[in-house]
């Protein structure tokens, strides 16, 4: 019987779960050759995107880890992480504490007029405390980042502040006014909850809004600063003091970046010098006549920052504000996030090294890591082979490109320290889990800040991850020439050592290939490859643009095709490379399996798995995204791949079997 020679069904629980997932999300009554997005995602259109679903699964896993009763070594990182999580979940204690802990913080900062008691303290003392002890930056942001000329040298960066309201430079007056109106209502609620006299609260909240509004007016748009060469300006602390004298830069920065030793001649990177000048003038103006309002503005800002650590009245006020602001900016309402999720995220932020080790131990064991590395190697080899056959690359460029791939480092699952338990077993000696949840949060904020500074000060640190191991976003770091695939991404339904290889190559493999192609994004920019056959490259470029432009857009979907070109190229190329790697794998190794009752061949499962990654509901935000809308991310690459039409037997001229195709990668 010839049937027995074919791929056998995978009947393990992971395969059956995946089959059920595919059956639940797909709509097999749709013709795959005309609308594969609906074929794969038809029933899932209204649900979260597949990445969000996976992120939630990972958080659930962290939750289970944190809720298991364990006898940890007293004072260990694990014990502190568990205590912190439990204290976050103990809403009864948080409610009972009420505003007491916060009032205590306000008193330490010198009080405020809103509730009567306030000592006319030194403005810079308050600012210094806010920055160094509370991680709150009311007038500008200060952080450690790579030196523009030497990415491995850390340097203090002074940047525009982050506003708590979704303001845009080109917003019409009406939206601007409504946003501030809602924010004013919110600030009034905060002041009243803290025992302020309503008319005094209104006066101070209104002035806080005015300060925010004026600071926002001073911001220069990124493009304007870039065009004027003012995005990275090297300035000493002394020069900064001259430009923006209202701020005691040396003492504020010294306190914030302890144990760094700063001097007036210390160089910093400033991202908007003009903003800092204007901000300083505003502060000086207010220090003359309205010092108490300036204090209220800083404290209200801190209260907003700390509100997630406060009782339900503060949470509810915040939730209402977010809801109103989303309505005003025409965003869909945010689904309510359960308390456990907030607590998992907070614990993850403050105790990342500890949670990373626990997560990786449970979700990314040695066999999973080994399978993921094998998959990556297969993808990398396919890319190297492919680079030899690109018509727009001459031999010199091909060699350079191959060297670049060969020198690439990969970090799979978690960064090195998370995979070495002894390095991850941090003691967090400086964390005091206090009498109130707020005090615990503040202690964690200080500890985290100190750890960040310390990690920057270590000589030649390895690549500093931009994501946590349980996150679902892979990325390529240009400065470190490293590609990162967090453990959180390499999970079902995208990857599992026990899946049919078609699934792993189609889902995780195409993601890996996509990220690898970002190594070469520079080549695709105008003038980015002087040694290339630029005519051929330009042709491929235009072909791909036209190819994507030809697809019909679902109603109310918009996107900017000049923003999305590089991602589209990586999508199309990534699918082709993953398919090439998979085909080679099939030739060399027998014993492929399929998912039962789907009636799909291994190659069809490969494409189905690729599409599954892209399942999500289109959103209004797509117009600012560097990725195309989801259906285009499926149809663009599939229609560019002749094998798709072959394996799904698509008629010539069908949407996903066009008469001509483009090849960039």
């Amino acid at each position: 019987n010839f049937q027995n020679c074919g791929p056998r069904p995978c009947e393990t629980s992971v395969c059956l779960d995946l089959r059920d997932h595919y059956l639940a999300s797909g709509n097999t009554s749709v013709a795959p050759c005309t609308d594969f997005f609906s074929f794969a995602c038809g029933r899932a259109k209204e649900t979260n995107n597949s990445f969000q679903e996976l992120a939630t699964k990972n958080k659930n896993r962290l939750r289970r880890i944190l809720e298991v009763q364990n006898s940890w070594h007293p004072g260990s990182g694990e014990e502190k992480a568990f205590q912190f999580y439990n204290s976050c979940m103990d809403t009864l204690a948080i409610e009972a504490a009420g505003t007491g802990p916060l009032r205590q913080v306000i008193e330490e900062l010198g009080g405020w007029r809103i509730s009567g008691k306030w000592t006319s303290l030194n403005f810079n003392r308050t600012l210094r405390l806010l920055m160094s002890q509370y991680g709150h930056f009311p007038f500008f942001r200060a952080y450690l980042g790579p030196h523009p000329a030497s990415p491995h040298t850390p340097v203090i960066q002074i940047d525009q502040p982050e506003f708590d309201v979704p303001l845009k430079q080109d917003q019409e007056q009406k939206i601007y006014a409504q946003i501030f109106r809602e924010y004013l209502t919110y600030l009034n609620q905060l002041g009243t909850l803290l025992g302020g006299d309503p008319s005094k609260v209104q006066e101070h909240s209104s002035l806080s809004i005015s300060i925010t509004s004026r600071l926002f007016q001073f911001l220069r748009p990124l493009e304007q600063r870039r065009a004027q060469g003012k995005l990275f300006q090297m300035v000493t602390i002394d020069q900064l003091k001259e430009m923006a004298p209202a701020i005691d830069w040396l003492s504020c920065l010294q306190a914030t970046f302890t144990p760094m030793s700063l001097s007036p001649s210390q160089s910093l990177v400033v991202h908007d010098v003009e903003y800092l000048k204007n901000m300083s003038q505003l502060v000086e103006e207010m220090l003359l006549k309205q010092r108490d309002f300036l204090q209220s503005h800083m404290i209200l800002g801190l209260v907003v920052t700390l509100s997630p650590a406060l009782d339900s009245q503060f949470q509810e006020a915040r939730r209402k504000l977010s809801q109103k602001l989303r309505e005003l900016t025409e965003q869909p309402p945010m689904p309510a996030r359960p308390r456990w999720m907030k607590c998992v995220e907070e614990t993850g932020t403050f105790f990342e090294p500890t949670l990373a080790a626990l997560f990786v131990r449970e979700a990314f064991g040695p066999s999973t890591r080994s399978a993921a590395m094998k998959l990556f190697t297969a993808i990398r080899d396919a890319l190297i082979t492919r680079l030899r056959n690109l018509p727009w690359m001459n031999e010199e460029t091909q060699n350079m490109a191959q060297d670049k791939v060969a020198q690439l480092q990969v970090e799979m699952g978690a960064s090195e320290w998370a995979l070495k338990p002894e390095l991850a077993r941090q003691e967090y000696n400086d964390i005091q889990l206090g009498s109130s949840f707020l005090q615990s949060v503040l202690s964690c904020v200080r500890s985290l800040r100190a750890r960040i500074v310390q990690s920057f000060l270590q000589p030649h640190p390895q690549h500093r991850w931009k994501v946590s191991p349980w996150d679902v976003n892979a990325y390529y770091s240009v400065s470190d020439h490293v590609v990162v695939f967090p453990a959180g991404l390499l999970q079902p339904p995208f990857f599992h050592p026990g899946y049919p290889r078609a699934v792993n190559f189609g889902a995780a493999g195409s993601i890996m290939a996509h990220e690898l192609l970002h190594i070469f994004y520079q080549l695709l920019l105008p003038g980015g490859c002087l040694a290339c056959d630029n005519h051929a490259l330009q042709e491929a470029h235009l072909c791909l643009k036209r190819h994507y432009a030809a697809f019909p857009l679902p109603s109310r979907t918009s996107f900017n095709d000049s923003l999305t070109f590089l991602e589209n190229a990586a999508d199309v190329g990534g699918l082709a490379i993953a398919l090439q790697a998979y085909s080679k794998r099939l030739l060399r190794h027998h014993g492929e399996t399929v998912l039962p009752s789907l009636d799909l061949s291994p190659q069809q499962i490969f494409f189905r798995s690729y599409a599954q990654v892209m399942c999500r509901k289109p959103s209004p935000q797509d117009s600012h995204d560097t990725h195309s809308p989801p259906h285009l991310r499926v149809h663009g690459p599939l229609s560019s791949t002749p094998a798709f039409a072959r394996y799904f037997r698509c008629a010539r001229g069908a949407l996903l079997n066009p008469s001509s195709r483009c090849q960039l990668w």
């Epitope: 430079q169 007056q173 109106r181 209104q202 509004s213 007016q217 204007n278």
Partner: antibody, heavy 120, light 107 residues
Framework: EVKLEESGGGLVQPGGSMKLSCVAS????????MNWVRQPPEKGLEWVAE??????????HYAESVKGKFTISRDDSKSSVYLQMNDLRAEDTGIYYC???????????WGQGTLVTVSA | DIVMTQSHKFMSTSVGDRVSITCKAS??????VAWYQQKPGQSPKLLIY???TRHTGVPDRFTGSGSGTDYTLTISSVQAEDLALYYC?????????FGSGTKLEIK
């Protein structure tokens, strides 16, 4: 002390042009949005034009009645805001006030005004 | 354009009285409303903004209230120096429009 001082008003014939100036002192002029508001004789107030900051690319807004006729501009180095008025008509007669925006809205400081009379 | 209607051109009151001046917007202006006082021969002065916030230095006998389309300026105990024209203004959207003004006269 915040001071706004308008000048340039006077008598002008219908169809004529005139440029009003307003010099500011007592505050960092370049940090504030500025406006012109007018008041016809024995009538109420009418907002005329607004100019924003350098960081906002000196964005301007006008009342419909003056669009295409009036131009607001500023010179931060001179702490001055101007209103160039062309093709003046009798209905443009009135006291013209220069005002400062405290934030994105409220006019918290006003000049003493300059009288513009459009008459044959 | 949004029309701000002050239905009373004049209001007559005595020193010590409580008086309320009203203003109606032709559409919801979301409390982005200011009140200005203009004394004879002088330029206007900002009294109230955000519909109910007193501007710095404004005596607390002046209070503002309202939301949506209806706004009120109240003087709790009128003083002789309050004799003036009072204007409401919306700053919700351009063009920023003023009411026609209410003249407060002392009996």
């Amino acid at each position: 002390e915040v001071k706004l001082e308008e000048s340039g008003g006077g008598l002008v014939q219908p169809g004529g042009s005139m440029k009003l100036s307003c010099v500011a002192s007592g505050f960092t002029f370049s940090n504030y949005w500025m406006n012109w508001v007018r008041q016809p004789p024995e009538k109420g107030l009418e907002w005329v034009a607004e100019i924003r900051l350098n960081s906002n690319n000196y964005a301007t807004h006008y009342a419909e009645s003056v669009k295409g006729k009036f131009t607001i501009s500023r010179d931060d180095s001179k702490s001055s805001v101007y209103l160039q008025m062309n093709d003046l008509r009798a209905e443009d007669t009135g006291i013209y006030y220069c005002t400062r925006n405290w934030d994105f809205a409220w006019f918290d400081s006003w000049g003493q005004g300059t009288l513009v009379t459009v008459s044959a | 354009d949004i029309v701000m209607t002050q239905s009373h051109k004049f209001m007559s009151t005595s020193v010590g009285d409580r008086v309320s001046i009203t203003c109606k917007a032709s559409q919801d202006v979301s409390t982005v409303v200011a009140w200005y006082q203009q004394k004879p021969g002088q330029s206007p002065k900002l009294l109230i903004y955000w519909a109910s916030t007193r501007h710095t230095g404004v005596p607390d006998r002046f209070t503002g209230s309202g939301s949506g389309t209806d706004y009120t300026l109240t003087i709790s105990s009128v003083q002789a120096e309050d004799l003036a024209l009072y204007y409401c203004q919306q700053h919700y959207t351009t063009p920023f429009t003023f009411g026609s003004g209410t003249k407060l006269e002392i009996k």
